[in-house]
């Protein structure tokens, strides 16, 4: 009789290659009835949580994670997780940023739109039946900035 | 094994203040609700409040300017309670987001 | 206000028959964030089902939940003399408020 939670997904706007100084959002998305959001680095341990989770559709609730100034630390992995209480979601495929030096403005050509990794069929390696991320590290405010306040 | 246990119920005078702890052993209570609810003798169950893994406070209307919940570290929540009464005498309970219990610590108001 | 009301105390059935508590809120709760727990004297309470209708790990599938929206619904059938305890029901609202009903007795005769 466990319901299973889907997958999250993951998108990020405008896109996932991003020129230095430019913003970029993350948008995680998950079921109804979602509490909280948390976006990873790779490292579990690095992340960012918001309640700021809105309704995308009648099916589907959302966050949204925005870098306000992407600089060449905020390049690499990320993925999405979600707790809809009791338990935690498995987490989404990793999103790869890049971060390109300028060559031309924020709206440069080559700046990809809207690429996202969404759920797939295999199954993830941690089974979060437990439903906790194995991380007990503290949130990293000094790598994601959003609206929310922590 | 996962637990929680309260700490800090005492007999209290009206008008006074206390400070309750929930101790977690074997999770990190940043990645769950850490809810408080109540329970005055004889009486029914009554949710206070919860902190959640964002470290937002989320609490009942009745609560509001009374009730602080706050963390304290990755394995403890407090809750601050202030301006008490009578009608405050309770067992009080925290939960891990509502499958795991501690066993209660007892207020007490009185002169 | 929201209320949750729960069936009146007490409810009394006999070892091996079937119970049914209900509760109703005054407004829908959200995304099926329904909860029951059963409380014996002395103890915390002990979650037996949530979303509604999903049972806690451990709890005898003698136990299950139903409803929606307003309407929901605890049934324990093959009662043991172990089931006598008070039965609350708890709702989830938009907000991340909850709030538990009265709590309804079960004797088992």
């Known amino acids: 009789q466990e319901e299973d939670l889907p997958r999250p997904s993951i998108s990020a706007e405008p896109g996932t290659v991003i020129p230095l100084g430019s913003h970029v959002t993350f948008v995680c998305r998950g079921p109804v009835g979602v509490q909280t959001f948390r976006l990873e680095r790779e490292s579990r341990s690095t992340y960012n949580d918001t309640e700021d989770v809105s309704q995308a559709s009648p099916s589907e609730s959302e966050a949204r994670f925005r870098i306000d100034s992407v600089s060449e630390g905020n390049a690499g992995p990320y993925r999405c997780i979600y707790y809809k209480p009791p338990k935690w979601s498995e987490q989404s495929d990793y999103l790869e940023l890049l971060v390109k030096e300028t060559s031309g403005g924020p709206d440069s050509p080559d700046t990809e739109p809207g690429s996202s990794a969404g759920p797939t069929q295999r199954p993830s390696d941690n089974s979060h039946n437990e439903h906790a991320p194995a991380s007990q590290g503290l949130k990293a405010e000094h790598l994601y900035h959003h609206h929310h306040h922590h | 094994e996962q637990s929680l246990k309260e700490s800090g119920g005492r007999l209290v005078t009206p008008g006074g203040s206390l400070t309750l702890t929930c101790t977690a052993s074997g999770f990190d209570i940043n990645n769950y609700n850490i809810q408080w609810v109540r329970q005055a003798p004889g009486k029914g169950l009554e949710w206070i409040g919860f902190i959640s893994p964002a470290g937002n406070e989320y609490s009942a209307t009745w609560a509001k300017g009374r009730f602080t919940i706050y963390k304290t570290s990755s394995t403890t929540v407090e809750l601050k309670m202030t301006s008490l009464t009578a009608s405050d005498t309770a067992t009080y309970f925290c939960a891990r987001h509502w499958d795991s219990w501690g066993p209660g610590t007892l207020v007490t108001i009185s002169s | 206000e929201l209320v949750m009301t729960q069936t009146e105390s007490p409810v009394s059935a006999a070892v091996g028959g079937t119970v049914t508590i209900s509760c109703q809120s005054s407004q829908s709760v959200y995304s099926n964030r329904l909860s029951w727990f059963q409380q014996k004297p002395g103890q915390p309470p002990k979650e037996l089902v949530y979303?509604?209708?999903t049972l806690q790990s451990g709890v005898p599938s003698r136990f299950s939940g139903s409803g929606s929206g307003t309407q929901f619904t605890l049934t324990i059938s093959d009662l043991e003399c172990d089931d006598a305890a008070t039965y609350y029901c708890?709702?989830?609202?938009?907000?991340?408020?909850?709030?538990f009903g009265g709590g309804t007795e079960v004797e088992i005769k």
């Open positions: 979303w509604t209708s």
């Open positions: 708890l709702g989830g609202y938009s907000g991340n408020i909850y709030v």
